[in-house]
């Protein structure tokens, strides 16, 4: 039964699909935004280097009680190879530079769209 269970469970999601789903979620957030996203919370800006997904997660995970970005946080954790917890500060963050969550999500979306167009799925 253990072996057969493996056949029933879906295989790993292709990186292109995962990225497309993350983009779609960010599009939903930006389009459905009525009140200020996460009450106008501020997060650290990030450098767009190899660890960009982890850095983005480390920024957003510090925003608590904001259901609008919970799915994004979960999806980003799938791109980040290590466990991320609130309060972590990565070298991938831009120190002393905080921006509104809404702008962060909007800019992350723009960047991910560019990556998708260029075929950079990881």
């Amino acid at each position: 039964l253990t072996c057969l269970g493996g056949f029933a469970s879906p295989g790993p999601v292709p990186p292109s699909t995962a990225l497309r789903e993350l983009i779609e979620e960010l599009v939903n957030i930006t389009q459905n935004q009525k009140a200020p996203l996460c009450n106008g919370s501020m997060v650290w800006s990030i450098n767009l280097t190899a660890g960009m997904y982890c850095a983005a997660l480390e920024s957003l995970i510090n925003v608590s009680g904001c259901s609008a970005i919970e799915k994004t946080q979960r999806m980003l954790s799938g791109f980040c190879p290590h466990k991320v917890s609130a309060g972590q500060f990565s070298s991938l963050h831009v120190r002393d530079t905080k921006i509104e969550v809404a702008q962060f999500v909007k800019d992350l979306l723009l960047h991910l769209k560019k990556l998708f167009r260029e075929g950079q799925f990881n």
Epitope: L48, K106, L108
Partner: nanobody, 118 residues
Amino acid sequence: GVQLLESGGGLVQPGGSLRLSCAASGFIFAVYDMGWARQAPGKGLEWVSSINDGGNVTYYADSVKGRFTISRDNSKNTLYLQMNSLRAEDTAVYYCATAEDEPGYDYRGQGTLVTVSS
């Protein structure tokens, strides 16, 4: 919110040089293609130069090619325009702006005045 703050403009003699800077804040600067536009007195807005997000692809209007150089420092959230061999016709207000095709990503600074006169 998003802010683009230009500096470095001023009065310069023909043949002289100026370096404009644009300090960006309130957004993830390194995501954006950026550029410089200008508006001469009584004229329309003219796109001068642009640079892609990574800083390795540039564009110049024919009127400034070979004289102006655009660059950026993503670690400092700053865009630059080095202007050499300035001419009277370069007199204008110079604006720093995002250069994205995507709707909703267009931001522009207040501008800095460059006057080329003897």
